[in-house]
Interface confidence: low
């Protein structure tokens, strides 16, 4: 837009120069014509004026077609003095001042139009700039807003995790305390009874049970890996959560399958048991029959 401004100013200057030049031409013509015969001079001046106007109109038309001219130099006027101007009848006098005034008015109007167009463009550009600034500001505000929300959410999430951790730890401690209390109560009972055999039996039993529990713990430990999540970022945590969810989903499916299998096996055992019972009944009956037969 700065370049446009410069070009426009240049064009304005050029037009002013052209106007001044024309004025000088007319003034020169007037001086010459005063010296020459009045009628001829008037006719000649009018013809030259007409030609000058035609020349300029042609030039303007060309400029309108080709767009603004690269070179800003004023073009030389080409008058044709060898052509004989038409005679103006006596009594008709050309008003040079009027022609000049109209000419100046036309130039001034054009200039005014150019200036207005220039300022209109400038105003539009300024408005666009303001609008752009507004939008940039707004985006900045929106992004800050989104960032603030994200930070809030992150804080909430961290708090939730912290609460969850605290709750788990508390539960763990409570369970430990409960186990310790039970063990103590059990040990007190054993000491109080003083039955060595019973104690030995109990120890054997509890030892056996302990082994089963150990087995269970071992299996669970293998399945339940340590949840090291402190170093993970939000996306990784989300992935981890999905992973855990999937493993729970798989375990549930596995559990369901095992339960179904267990039901099936239970059913089969019952079928077999019934079959055995039936066989036993049959064999008992047969046995009795044989004996009876023998004793008879």
């Amino acid at each position: 837009s700065d370049i446009e401004e410069v070009v426009e100013e240049y064009e304005e200057e050029e037009q002013e120069e052209a106007a001044v030049e024309e004025e000088e031409d007319w003034r020169e013509d007037e001086d010459e014509q005063e010296e020459a015969a009045e009628e001829d001079a008037e006719a000649e001046a009018e013809t030259e004026e007409t030609r000058a106007e035609e020349d300029e109109e042609e030039e303007e038309a060309k400029e309108a077609e080709d767009g603004p001219m690269e070179e800003s130099k004023p073009k030389p006027r080409s008058f044709m003095p060898n052509l004989v101007p038409p005679k103006i009848p006596d009594g008709e006098r050309v008003d040079f001042d009027d022609i000049h005034r109209k000419r100046m008015e036309k130039d001034l109007n054009e200039l005014q139009a150019l200036i207005e167009a220039h300022f209109e463009n400038r105003k539009k550009e300024e408005e666009e700039l303001v609008s752009l600034k507004d939008r940039i500001e707004r985006r900045r505000a929106e992004r800050a807003e989104q960032q603030r929300i994200r930070n809030e959410r992150e804080k909430e999430r961290q708090n939730r995790l912290a609460e969850e951790r605290a709750r788990r730890e508390e539960e763990e401690n409570r369970r430990k305390a409960e186990d310790a209390r039970k063990k103590k109560a059990l040990s007190n009972m054993m000491h109080f009874g003083g039955y060595i055999q019973k104690q030995a039996q109990t120890e054997r039993k509890s030892g056996k049970r302990q082994t089963e529990r150990e087995k269970k713990k071992k299996i669970l430990a293998e399945r339940r890996k340590v949840l090291a999540i402190d170093h993970l970022n939000e996306d990784q945590l989300r992935e981890k959560a999905k992973e855990l969810w999937q493993s729970i989903y798989n375990l549930e499916a596995e559990k369901f399958d095992l339960q179904e299998k267990f039901k099936q096996q239970k059913y089969e055992i019952n079928v077999l048991r019934n079959r055995i019972n039936d066989n036993q009944k049959v064999s008992k009956t047969r046995g009795k029959a044989k004996v009876t037969g023998r004793w008879k």
């Epitope: 929106e142 992004r143 807003e145 929300i149």
Partner: antibody, heavy 114, light 111 residues
Framework: EVQLQQSGPELVKPGASVKMSCKAS????????MKWVKQSHGKSLEWIGD????????FYNQKFKDKATLTVDKSSSTAYMQLNSLTSEDSAVYYC???????WGQGTTLTVSS | DIVLTQSPASLAVSLGQRATISCKAS??????????MNWFQQKAGQPPKRLIY???NLESGIPARFSGRGSGTDFALNIHPVEEEDAATYYC?????????FGGGTKLEIK
């Protein structure tokens, strides 16, 4: 709890104008832009514009620039949208929303019919 | 304006299966490492409800079976396993550039 309570349904004649409201509660009204969204029957959603409750600064979707005028009243934590030169094309559900479309009003149904 | 094209327009998924909705933007909605893409769920007679913000961040209180992914111009919303209550219309929406625009919507039915 963030809540946006919108004014009731409107039935207006073509050529008339209408002004609907959206009363905010449960948060600091000036903290977030108030957004307005149009949903024509069975169609998708269109963003109309935003207003900054702090200074009344507005941002419009060019499509609605001559149709909607957004204003706010800080004292009552209420945002307003005026729709002018109504035609049947303006019949729709209009929602207000805030905090980057996080919370929404229940919507105001506008019916333009002669 | 950024045009968001959602596909498919409607989708029927069996209970417990996976539903995937795609959203393509006519130009990138990324800015400074963040994708400004949101996903909404809308049930009949209710306002939209935001499920996902910034392409993959789950809104608090939204079940983990909803997930979003993508960046630049290609985004997707996944629901797995689909539940009865997920029957609704889903919209993607970009908030990276004025005017904010929404996708045409995808209607999800549960078989």
């Amino acid at each position: 709890e963030v809540q946006l309570q919108q004014s009731g349904p409107e039935l207006v004649k073509p050529g008339a104008s209408v002004k609907m409201s959206c009363k905010a509660s449960g948060y600091t009204f000036t903290d977030y832009y108030m957004k307005w969204v149009k949903q024509s029957h069975g169609k998708s959603l269109e963003w109309i514009g935003d207003i900054n409750p702090n200074n009344g600064e507005t941002f419009y979707n060019q499509k609605f620039k001559d149709k909607a005028t957004l204003t706010v009243d800080k004292s009552s934590s209420t945002a307003y949208m005026q729709l002018n030169s109504l035609t049947s094309e303006d019949s729709a559900v209009y929602y207000c929303a805030t905090r980057v479309f996080d919370f929404w009003g229940q919507g105001t149904t506008l019916t333009v019919s002669s | 304006d950024i045009v968001l094209t959602q596909s498919p327009a409607s989708l029927a998924v069996s209970l417990g299966q996976r539903a995937t909705i795609s959203c393509k933007a006519s130009q990138s909605v990324d800015y400074d490492g963040t994708s400004y893409m949101n996903w909404f769920q809308q049930k009949a007679g209710q306002p939209p409800k935001r499920l996902i913000y910034a392409a993959s961040n789950l809104e608090s209180g939204i079940p983990a079976r909803f997930s979003g992914r993508g960046s630049g111009t290609d985004f997707a919303l996944n629901i797995h396993p689909v539940e009865e209550e997920d029957a609704a219309t889903y919209y993607c929406q970009q908030s990276n550039e004025d005017p904010y625009t929404f996708g045409g919507g995808t209607k999800l039915e549960i078989k």
